[in-house]
């Protein structure tokens, strides 16, 4: 299953399959997730080691048993790959690293006014993988405001150095935020020239294209079909690049297919997995296990659940079957692709779904451990769980926020439905940033069921929580995916990085905002909060947040939306925007429904008809 815990001051011994430099443990974990054989990783921050060569070292590891011995190493961070972790799988990495220079091939230098602009330039340059920006206080005047666009053979820095007044980061192309746009066209009977960066075997051009999309240096590809004239080159997928970023020439060639990486697509990237099953095809590779199962779909599920399994073949040969079950061969290779592909067989083959974003219906397993007033504009995909709850009577208007917590579930505030309990009048918009982008053609979700907490009473602040079951499940994308729920009764975690988001009023007597707003607000103890609200009872099932001096808060229209906190690199839904005295008033914090206190209720209500939990929270 999905294991997200990080081990502080621990280093996994042995099992190395690759090493690289990464700026932090989260990026190292992402590289492990996308490496075909990596199950575990260990990261050495600069502070953890004197050896300059090993600073920022990210060590990717494999293990037949799924684990390795841990040794104590002060400052080191270790953990698991996020394979099998559904919506948490993403190659998108937005963080900016201050005081760090990520080295690589500098191929473009320009003057820009901010690190954000430098990151945008990198994202809009086809060859840029990461960048460094020298701030206005950099010690050498001639380098100030320089934006250096970079690449490297492996897509990660060739070295990382601590350097004052330098900020570094990665391209946001994997976040589907590139302005370049992509070529969806595939060209039949055409071969591209230029430099081959890798060669893998694939059953069709679509798998070849997805592999190209997630390969750090692939810009385009040529695939040789299973009837290509040279037998040894059949099913070969050549991943390619060029100086210009486009093929310098193409040659008409029977039984070849060519196309482009989809990494520069805006708003939608293909999933980093291949779910198609290929009948009459055998995939060869290193044998991991052989098991008897009923049907090819069960074989694929078995492969997906066995974390080291990369692909499989389900044999229908009479000698491989007994009763209704046949042999399911679970296999792996060094590069994650079959080492041999055979056609016209009695088998069906396919790939593990361990890297599919959708995962199962569960929301998230994590480690136990109102426009916004005074806020700023959010950017695409920054808060992909945020939804807008809108009512369509004669006109249509935004009324509340909400948080996507599963394919078919939204968590919001009960008071949003005061006087409007009819599910037919509601429209739920997900994956949006600007309310003005909503037109009559914009897809929306309808409500199947509104589940208001049984103890909620209108115009009281208690138990202000409601679940919405959507009529149809939503697919997950970089712009529309769920937020992890906290552990039941989560009291031990100290959250220091919390944000509230919404399209609500920007002042007490304001109006709904167009662009989703965000504001960073500190949590306030319940004791402190109670002092500020003498006339109300602040219960243990509430959480408060706000600045003593006011000025930043949720407001009308943000209700039901999320209060999220980042801990150990993972966002969790800590609160639901509920109520407050005015908005952003001095010494009047916002009051939020404490989600951790309602975990039993959430899990009980989201049980599917077959008894399987539709969301999963930490044990």
């Amino acid at each position: 299953g999905c294991l997200t815990q990080l081990y502080e001051n621990a280093f996994f011994r042995g099992g190395d399959v690759a090493s690289m430099y990464t700026p932090n443990a989260q990026y190292c974990q992402m590289r492990c997730t996308f490496h075909p054989r990596c199950l575990l990783f260990s990261f050495l921050p600069a502070s953890s080691i004197n050896d300059m060569e090993k600073r920022f070292g990210c060590f990717l590891k494999d293990s037949v048993t799924g684990t390795l011995p841990k040794v104590h190493r002060t400052g080191a961070v270790s953990g698991h790959s996020l394979k099998q972790c559904g919506h948490q799988i993403s190659a998108c990495h937005r963080d900016i690293y201050k005081g760090v220079d990520m080295r690589g091939v500098n191929f473009n230098v320009s003057k820009v006014s901010s690190v954000e602009e430098c990151q945008k330039r990198c994202t809009s340059n086809i060859r840029c993988q990461f960048f460094s920006y020298a701030t206005q206080t950099f010690h050498k005047a001639e380098y100030r405001n320089n934006c250096l666009l970079k690449y490297s053979p492996g897509g990660t820095p060739t070295a990382i150095k601590v350097l004052s007044n330098v900020e570094s980061g990665f391209s946001l192309k994997p976040c589907a935020l590139s302005e370049i746009g992509c070529h969806m066209n595939i060209f039949q009977h055409l071969a591209f020239s230029d430099v081959d960066v890798a060669r893998v075997l694939t059953p069709d051009a679509f798998v070849c294209r997805t592999i190209c999309t997630y390969h750090p240096n692939c810009l385009f590809f040529t695939f040789y079909t299973n009837v290509w004239k040279i037998e040894s080159q059949r099913n070969v997928c050549l991943l390619k690049t060029s100086e210009s970023g486009t093929p310098s020439s193409s040659t008409p060639q029977e039984n070849t297919i060519s196309g482009y990486s989809l990494l520069t697509c805006k708003r939608t990237l293909p999933e980093p997995c291949h779910s198609k099953i290929y009948p009459g095809v055998d995939f060869g590779g290193e044998e991991l296990n052989v098991t008897f199962v009923k049907g090819v779909n069960v074989c694929q599920e078995t492969c997906t659940k066995m974390i080291r399994c990369q692909f499989f073949t389900y044999s229908l040969l009479p000698e491989d079957c007994k009763e209704e079950k046949c042999k399911c061969f679970l296999r792996l290779s060094m590069d994650g692709s079959p080492t041999r592909i055979a056609y016209g067989t009695q088998g069906s083959s396919g790939y593990s779904l361990r890297l599919c974003n959708t995962g199962d219906n569960s929301v998230c397993t994590t480690k136990t451990s109102t426009r916004i007033v005074g806020g700023t504009n959010s950017s695409w995909g920054e808060w992909p769980w945020q939804v807008s709850l809108q009512v369509k009577l004669t006109a249509q208007r935004h009324l509340c926020g909400g948080s996507l917590i599963g394919h078919q579930w939204v968590l919001t505030a009960a008071h949003c439905f005061d006087g409007l309990p009819l599910q037919d009048v509601w429209r739920i918009y997900s994956g949006i940033l600007n309310l003005s982008d909503i037109t009559k053609d914009t897809p929306f979700s309808q409500i199947k069921e509104i589940i208001i907490h049984q103890n909620y009473k209108v115009s009281e602040g208690n138990h202000d929580i409601a679940l919405i079951k959507l009529q149809a499940p939503l697919n997950y994308t970089e712009f529309q995916k769920p937020i992890c729920l906290p552990s039941k009764g989560d009291t031990s975690t100290i959250y220091t990085n919390c944000w509230v988001t919404g399209w609500g009023f920007s002042k007490e007597k304001g109006e709904i905002q167009n662009i989703l707003q965000k504001v960073n607000i500190p949590l306030v103890t319940n004791e402190e909060c109670q002092k500020r609200y003498q006339d109300y009872k602040i219960t243990q099932r509430m959480v408060c947040a706000g600045y003593k001096e006011g000025g930043k808060d949720a407001c009308k229209g943000d209700s039901g939306g999320p209060l999220v906190c980042k801990h150990n690199g993972m966002w969790r839904l800590v609160g639901i925007t509920s109520w407050g005295e005015g908005c952003a008033r001095r010494e009047q914090p916002g009051v939020y429904t404490k989600v951790a206190e309602y975990m039993d209720w959430i899990l009980e209500k989201t049980q599917s008809s077959d008894g399987k939990a539709q969301m999963q929270s930490p044990a």
């Epitope: 679509f206 095809v281 056609y343």
Partner: antibody, heavy 118, light 107 residues
Framework: EVQLLESGGGLVQPGGSLRLSCAAS????????MEWVRQAPGKGLEWVSS????????IYADSVKGRFTISRDNSKNTLYLQMNSLRAEDTAVYYC???????????WGQGTMVTVSS | DIQMTQSPSSLSASVGDRVTITCRAS??????LNWYQQKPGKAPKVLIH???TLESGVPSRFSGSGSGTDFTLTISSLQPEDFATYYC?????????FGQGTKLEVR
């Protein structure tokens, strides 16, 4: 010119049999998956069966499984559909089609009519 | 089996109009989606494969887009010869299934 030409259709009684043929020309027949698709009068398209280039792998729609058999003779550049235990609901125009490199049915025959009636 | 749902089932339009036909798959099919045109008494003809790749010889006024479950066929400026029935089809998994068709008629 790339071409597919079906033959063998006609009127047959329920429970009867018929063998359809599809002659291919203008391309390397043994390089491609081949398909049979049918269309009942006034209705939409329904995929019937598929065969791999070597003939080693065959797939059928549930509606015809156990009654129809797809085969090919690469030396004769010909695709076949043996239809047994025919029913009234099998009445349709039957098309043979080539599955192209990108899995679309890129070349179609002109179709042959099969009528199952007593 | 994967169900393919086309909308609308029929459409009246005039020469020069921009026309859009949508196709929804009951589960994600990546870009394994093809569009066909069929005229009365004739065999279908492929227009677009892999969701957006135009078949050679097909006029550029035809375009396709989409991935996953939602797909669109657009005719940017309708010509007299475009009045026909259009089908989408998934080639993601067997049984390969077609949409029920969209009949494009003269207004």
């Amino acid at each position: 010119e790339v071409q597919l030409l079906e033959s063998g259709g006609g009127l047959v009684q329920p429970g009867g049999s018929l063998r359809l043929s599809c002659a291919a020309s203008g391309f390397t027949f043994s390089d491609y998956d081949m398909e049979w698709v049918r269309q009942a009068p006034g209705k939409g398209l329904e995929w019937v069966s598929s065969i791999s280039p070597s003939g080693g792998s065959t797939i059928y729609a549930d509606s015809v499984k156990g009654r129809f058999t797809i085969s090919r003779d690469n030396s004769k550049n010909t695709l076949y559909l043996q239809m047994n235990s025919l029913r009234a609901e099998d009445t349709a125009v039957y098309y043979c089609a080539r599955q192209g490199l990108l899995t679309a049915f890129d070349i179609w025959g002109q179709g042959t009519m099969v009528t199952v009636s007593s | 089996d994967i169900q393919m749902t086309q909308s609308p089932s029929s459409l009246s339009a005039s020469v020069g109009d921009r026309v859009t036909i949508t196709c929804r798959a009951s589960q994600s099919i990546n870009t394994y989606l093809n569009w066909y045109q069929q005229k009365p008494g004739k065999a279908p003809k492929v227009l677009i494969h892999a969701a957006s790749t135009l078949e050679s010889g097909v006029p550029s006024r035809f375009s396709g887009s989409g991935s996953g479950t939602d797909f669109t066929l657009t005719i940017s400026s309708l010509q007299p010869e475009d009045f026909a029935t259009y089908y989408c089809q998934q080639s993601y998994s067997t049984p390969y299934t077609f949409g029920q068709g969209t009949k494009l008629e003269v207004r």
